[in-house]
Each structure stands twice: as C-alpha cells, then as structure tokens.
C-alpha cells in the first residue's frame, strides 16, 4: 500500500516550527513529507482554516526513477511583514487517497514594542476652549500603558492614573505640542507629536453703531486670544441676494464679498462705498500671530435710504393764458431709495413762492391767478424719497406758448449749491 494511506501513519517527516517576532518581520514556516506515488498538493491551515491565498511554494524531489517510488515534498509558507492577523496555529494538510493528514502545529506569535492604532493629530482650537485628543496602542505583549505629554512634560504621575485613550484638554492659552508614549514589556514607543495651534475665539456681539446711505459703522467684542495679541480684524460685507441667500451660519455667500481690515483696538470699523437702501450681510473674524478666528455668523443689515443725488431732468414750462404746463423726467443721478414723488415750486417776480407736492406724476398744469399777468414766472422741481428732498432744479422761466411751435426745453446745467436735505427718522 502507498505510504501514508493508513490512518495511524502520518506522511509528515518535518513539522512547522515557531515564529515569534515584532511587526513587520518576515519569516518562513516549513513542512516536509515523504509519500509513495504521485505527490499530493500541500495546503496550509491557520487555526484550522485553509489559507486560500497563502504565499507558499512546494518542492517535490523523487527518491527513485519509477513514479511509484517515494517522493520528498517540501512546502514553505512565507509570512511577509508580520501582523496581528498572521498570528495563530499553523499546520500542513494533505489528502492521500481517502484520508486526510495534518502535521503537528507550529505557532506564529507577535511580540514587540507597542504599535499605535491611533495617534494625536494636528489641529487648531480657539483659545480657552475644551477639546479632546486620541491615542491608542496595542501589543502584544499586553498590557500597554499610555502616558500623555504636553510640551514634552508628562501629564500624569502614574500609569492607570492619567488619561488613557482620550485626553480631555480644558483649554489652552498658547500653541502647544501633545504626544503619547506607549509602554509594554518590550519597551516604549512614542507617537507623532501633534501641534495644537491656539487661534483667537470667534468675535461676539457684532452690531451696527450708525448707518448712512453709503456707509455703515459696525462694532464687535473680540474673543480671547491666549497669549497672542490680536493683530487685526477682517470684516466682510456681501449683498443679500434679496435677503434669501444667507441664513445665519450658512456657508459662504455667492457673490465676492467686500473685505475690509480693521486695526485693533478699537474693535470698530466704518464700511464705505455701499449702495443706499440695500440689504447686506456682514461678518467679522479676528487674527493673531497664530492665525484667524472663525467667522461670526452672517448678520443682516441694511443701509438707509438717501435723498436723490440730482434734480429731475429735461424740465419744460410753457404758458397758455392762465394755465402753465410743466413736465420733466426722472433724475439721471442715483435716487438712493424709492422715489416717492416730486415737489414743484413756482414764483413770480413780486409774488410769494407756491410749493406743491405732485406725487409720482411727471407733469402738471398750473392754474395761474388773475389773467396771467404775473411776470417773470419761474418753476423749480425736486424729487424726493423717504429720506427727504433731493436737490432742486435751476429755476426754469415760463415761456409763452405759440401754436405750431415746439415747446421750449431747458436743460439742467448745474445743481443748486445748497440742496435741501430732509434727514431720515433714525
């Protein structure tokens, strides 16, 4: 009968040895068998399970010239870069005839310096703000003790007494380094050193101090910045996209923001070159030598209405008997708000001035008293918003109307030197 077919007679003449080493070690397990007839395929088991993707090589050497003679079969299993998952009991397995043979076991063990599964990471934190750091190490051999160090100084006096996997830091006032050390029966391993950069706290209480049609004055309260003085604060303003685009805490706005820097103190800034009667959102961040704070939430603000910056255009005034017909066009200059209407003033040489509110119409017919004998009649027009009257037009003399003639047009040449302002309610 072929060698190895009887249950009591194992074909194995060499069994796997033992390997114990540190992570990353490369080693080889070897088993040898002697069989009669065709050499079988050698399988490797780890903890009783066949290794499907084993890095193994099989060498077969005939001991005679006849293929029914004995063969020596050597199988080598290579373990590259030893890991915890490689540890366990290893055996060779062969199928001979209707029987299965398994070698004596060899053992692969892992034993070395602690290995970090998790190390502290670099991060930025606001001054005096609590945060956590994580560190995790394993053997074997176990147990593994951890020690946290801040700026190379141990944070506890005894293993088991200090924090282990998670370190809670109640707050820092200066940029610091943290690392952890892991110790087992093989020695000590040191983690990477994490740099925790202390940034200023987010400013608080961003608010409006005063408003003008094209400028806003804002102020805020700075947050703590640790041992690092604030160097400046940065304010951003953005058009509010119909008031819909930016909610509190929402990410960056769609438009390119208007950015201004304020030297500090004082924690106050005048934002100019804004559009009147326009909603904006503003936010602020403050910077130290370590970097910038986080931005405040977007604060909705609005510039107030202003008065129109120019008088109505193309005013014409013609007279026909006791009636005067006046018409004009909207000012070309910015209105700085919502146009509410026009005021008209007319005056004769020896008569008092008459003021009229025309509303939003751009023409008016005046009923002149008497038979129209008022001489040298002149008309002025001004546009107004909720903020008050814009500048008055230059006086336009009343022209006599002759049928068939075009009505004369008087171009506005220059503004009056002292336009009348009506200040808003705030």
């Amino acid at each position: 009968a072929p060698r190895g077919t009887q249950a009591e007679e194992s074909p194995f003449v060499g069994n796997p040895g033992n390997i114990t080493g540190a992570r990353g070690l490369t080693g080889t397990l070897r088993c040898q068998l002697q069989v009669q007839g065709e050499p079988p395929e050698v399988h490797w088991l780890r903890d009783g399970q066949i290794l499907e993707l084993a890095d193994s090589t099989q060498t077969q050497v005939p001991l005679g010239e006849d293929e029914q003679d004995d063969w020596i079969v050597v199988s080598q299993l290579r373990i590259t870069s030893l890991q915890l998952s490689d540890t366990g009991q290893y055996q060779c397995l062969v199928f001979l005839g209707h029987q299965t043979f398994v070698s004596q076991p060899g053992y692969v063990g892992l034993e070395g310096l602690p290995y970090f599964l998790e190390e502290p990471e670099d991060r930025t934190v606001a001054a005096n703000t609590p945060f956590n750091l994580s560190c995790q190490a394993q053997g074997p051999p176990e147990p593994v003790d951890l020690l946290w160090l801040q700026d190379a100084v141990p944070l506890a006096t005894a293993p088991g007494h200090g924090p282990q996997r998670s370190l809670h830091v109640p707050g820092l006032n200066k940029t610091s380094s943290f690392s952890c050390e892991a110790h087992n029966a093989k020695g000590v391993t040191t983690s990477r050193t994490a740099t925790i950069t202390v940034l200023p706290q987010q400013p608080r209480n961003l608010h409006l101090v005063s408003r003008q049609p094209t400028e806003l004055e804002v102020a805020w309260t700075p947050g703590l910045s640790g041992i690092y003085p604030l160097t400046h604060c940065t304010l951003q303003a953005v058009l509010s996209d119909d008031g819909m685009g930016i909610q509190a805490g929402e990410p960056d706005p769609p438009e390119e923001p208007l950015t201004s820097q304020a030297s500090v103190p004082p924690h106050q800034l005048r934002l100019g070159s804004l559009h009147p009667h326009t909603p904006y959102h503003i936010r602020v961040a403050c910077t130290s030598s370590q970097g910038p704070s986080s931005w405040t939430h977007w604060l909705p603000v609005e510039t107030p209405e202003g008065v129109p910056l120019g008088p109505p255009e193309n005013i014409s005034a013609t007279r026909n008997g006791s009636q005067a017909f006046v018409h004009w066009q909207e000012p070309r200059a910015p209105l700085q708000g919502t146009l509410l209407g026009y005021r008209l003033a007319y005056q004769g040489q020896d008569t008092p001035e008459v003021l009229m509110d025309i509303g939003l119409r751009q023409e008016v017919t005046l009923e002149l008293q008497g038979d129209g004998s008022v001489s040298n009649l002149t008309v002025c027009v001004a546009a107004y918003t909720a903020a008050g009257d814009g500048p008055w037009s230059l006086p336009v003399p009343l022209e006599a109307w002759r049928p068939g003639q075009a009505q004369p047009v008087h171009q506005l040449v220059k503004e009056p030197s002292t336009p009348a302002f009506s200040w808003p309610w705030w």
């Epitope: 310096l113 051999p141 176990e142 147990p143 003790d145 020690l147 190379a152 141990p154 506890a156 006096t157 005894a158 293993p159 088991g160 007494h161 050390e181 110790h183 029966a185 093989k186 020695g187 000590v188 040191t190």
Partner: antibody, heavy 118, light 107 residues
C-alpha cells in the same frame, strides 16, 4: 510617603533557591506602576532583573528568564523574588523599586545583601 | 541588549565647580536615559529621566541633555552633599541596563 523594604535570608547555599520579599507601604501595588527587582554585584555593577506590573503581568531579564519568578500578595501589599539554582555569581545586594511610569525608578528600598556560599 | 558605557568612572572636584558625566549607548535609545545618585545609608535617588526631565524635588543645579546615543549629566555649582556615586540607566527597551557608575569625590 511611599516606602519599600526588602527582607530575606542573608546566606543561601549554591543550587538552592533565593527568596526575597518587598513590603510596600504608602501605596497599593495594584493601583499603578511597575514593581521591580534590581541587584548590585560587588564592584558596583547594577543589573535589572524584572518587574511585576500593577495588572499582575511580569517581565524578566532574558539572562535570568529560566530561573526567575516574581509574584505578589496583594492582601499584604508585598511582591516577591524567587531565583532558582543559585551560584556564587548571584552574590549581590538586592533592591526592590517602583518605576515612575515606565521611565525609571523613583522609589528604591535600602537593599538587602545576599551571599551565596556553601 | 543595549550596552551603556559611562565615563569617567572616577571624578574629583571642589564645591562650587561644575562637572559633567557622560553616558554612551551601544545603539539609539531616543531620549530615554535616567540618572541616579547613590549614597551610603540612603535609598537611591532618581535625578533625571527621559534624558532631561528633572524629577520632582531635585535641585535645578542638576541637568541632563542628549538624545540618541550620547547623554550628559551636568551638576553646576557643586554642593557638599552632591559628592556621591552616580549611575545612568536606559529605559527605552527591556532589559533595562545601567552604566558602570561614576564616583564623584571632593578634591
């Protein structure tokens, strides 16, 4: 204050076992730290022998591994050294100590002198 | 095992002087070297660990430096009570090993 005190025989015959006790006061050996045995040979050479960790696990110097055993009695707050098959080469002053973390030994006993001789 | 070579083995100095003791490791031990003081009738005293960390309660005239393989203990402005035996010990890996010692005597 933490104190460690070694005790045991002054004289041991070759091939016998050397047994020493370290009694700790002022700190529980199960709370933290590792608890060590060190010896100093005539001529001042120091040798670290091994420790028992507060968890109960042990770690020995490979040069002594086949002969050394460190155990403890937590109820008495004591830990023990047993060194088997001693020879005259084991004549030394034996110290017990506590390690500061895994850095170094921050508390030592006074030491006990043991002579191996027939 | 890591071999530790300590030098000098003997040193004579006067109070007020500054002295240095050196230890060299046979391979890198990172920063993990400790220094001890031994005096007759007293328990051994830990002075420095992790190369340069001063143990609590030790006067600041003791300082340690070095990393890798070369380390130094410096005692500045020697006091009469500093004359003793000094040892270094690596605590980077087991088995922990010690230097051969330096005897500091009054000149």
């Amino acid at each position: 204050d933490v104190q460690l005190q070694e005790s045991g025989p002054d004289l041991v015959k070759p091939s016998q076992s050397l047994s020493l006790t370290c009694t700790v006061t002022g700190y529980s050996i199960t709370s933290a730290y590792s608890w060590h045995w060190i010896r100093q040979f005539p001529g001042n050479k120091l040798e670290w022998m091994g420790y028992i960790h507060y968890s109960g696990s042990t770690n020995y110097n490979p040069s002594l591994k086949s002969r050394i055993s460190i155990t403890r009695d937590t109820s008495k707050n004591q830990f023990f050294l047993q060194l088997n098959s001693v020879t005259t080469e084991d004549t030394a002053t034996y110290y017990c100590a506590r390690s500061l973390w895994f850095y170094a030994m921050d508390y030592w006993g006074q030491g006990t002198s043991v002579t191996v001789s027939s | 095992d890591v071999q530790i070579t300590q030098s000098p083995s003997y040193l004579a100095a006067s109070p007020g002087e500054t002295i240095t003791i050196n230890c060299r490791a046979s391979k890198s031990i990172s920063k993990y070297l400790a220094w001890y003081q031994e005096k007759p009738g007293k328990t051994n005293k830990l002075l420095i660990y992790s190369g340069s960390t001063l143990q609590s309660g030790i006067p600041s005239r003791f300082s340690g430096s070095g990393s890798g393989t070369d380390f130094t203990l410096t005692i500045s402005s020697l006091e009469p009570e500093d004359f003793a035996m000094y040892y270094c010990q690596q605590h980077n890996e087991y088995p922990w090993t010690f230097g051969g010692g330096t005897k500091l005597e009054i000149k």
